[in-house]
Interface confidence: low
Amino acid sequence: PRSIDVKYIGVKSAYVSYDVQKRTIYLNITNTLNITNNNYYSVEVENITAQVQFAKTVIGKARLNNITHIGPLDMKQIDYTVPTVIAEEMSYMYDFCTLISIKVHNIVLMMQVTVTTTYFGHSEQISQERYQYVDCGRNTTYQLGQSEYLNVLQPQQ
């Protein structure tokens, strides 16, 4: 079998809301993946599991099942959303994210994603990790070409 390539493209959008009483930030982060099938047969993308970390703490997880199949020598772009919550011991971030006098409220998040593909009964997992800046102070949509600009570190091999 030839390789199945997973490329994390970046954050597509981040939608934010707040709970003033609980000093809590809710961020729905939509990410984009490109999955390329370099084989001469179809493969199934069985599931995508993702999690987001802030300051080494997991703040959100998501799992998508039975997503799609990818034809021979084909590529599919898949968006997935991870709902995240910044609260409790990280509630100090509430002040930063709601501070009106600065224009960009960037926080550094680690995006972790694992894609499970199957073909002929064989299962393969491919993982990526990427640090990204996300604006926690407003709803933001990013151009896909912009994502590389947002990358702080290259993915770990």
Epitope: D95, T98, I100, S101, I102, V104, Y133
Partner: antibody, heavy 118, light 113 residues
Framework: EVQLQQSGPVLVKPGPPVKISCKAS????????IHWVKLSHGKSLEWIGL????????DYNQKFKGKATLTVDTSSSTAYMELNSLTSEDSAVYYC???????????WGQGTTVTVSS | DIVMTQSPSSLSVSAGEKVTMSCKSS????????????LAWYQQKPGQPPKLLIY???TRESGVPDRFTGSGSGTDFTLTISNVQAEDLAVYYC?????????FGAGTKLELK
Amino acid sequence: EVQLQQSGPVLVKPGPPVKISCKASGFTFTDYYIHWVKLSHGKSLEWIGLVYPYNGDTDYNQKFKGKATLTVDTSSSTAYMELNSLTSEDSAVYYCARTYYANSPDYWGQGTTVTVSS
Amino acid sequence: DIVMTQSPSSLSVSAGEKVTMSCKSSQSLLNSGNQRNYLAWYQQKPGQPPKLLIYGASTRESGVPDRFTGSGSGTDFTLTISNVQAEDLAVYYCQNDHSYPLTFGAGTKLELK
């Protein structure tokens, strides 16, 4: 140890521009905003503007637009301020400072004295 | 622009005394989103850069002695120094930390009697 090391004092003639620097160390340069503040003799502190090293974004006090230009070189973790069309009014001590969670600078450079004199 | 007005412009004190200085802003510095007041206090000694003492109107910066206390809300703020020490002699500035352009008061100079 967090440090903002500014360039030395300068004595310049009226007219030509001057560029002063602020080298950061001891923290992640692109995570902070770098502010510039002017202290004139017998006057209060005046906020000139800020630059965000992460993307080069700037915000100026309207009063200093056209007078000051703020830039960064992330490869050397250095912020720069260029002052043009110099007059005696520009004679002052200029400070760089950093902020993160708010706009209260917690670390300041030692200051650069600019003297404009013919 | 938000105008910051400090009073008095100078204060003469003896060591051990308690002093208060005032700062008024032309607009409220209260952020309704999180109910915090965005005002800072700085201390500046001759030949030195300003030093952050208080932010958020009342939160002491780490390492700042607890004899420095910030209070107030909205447009009226106060810095109190109890048991003044000789090393406290300096100019004290308040700063609008709420919106651009950031603005400073003219300062209150603390002198020895």
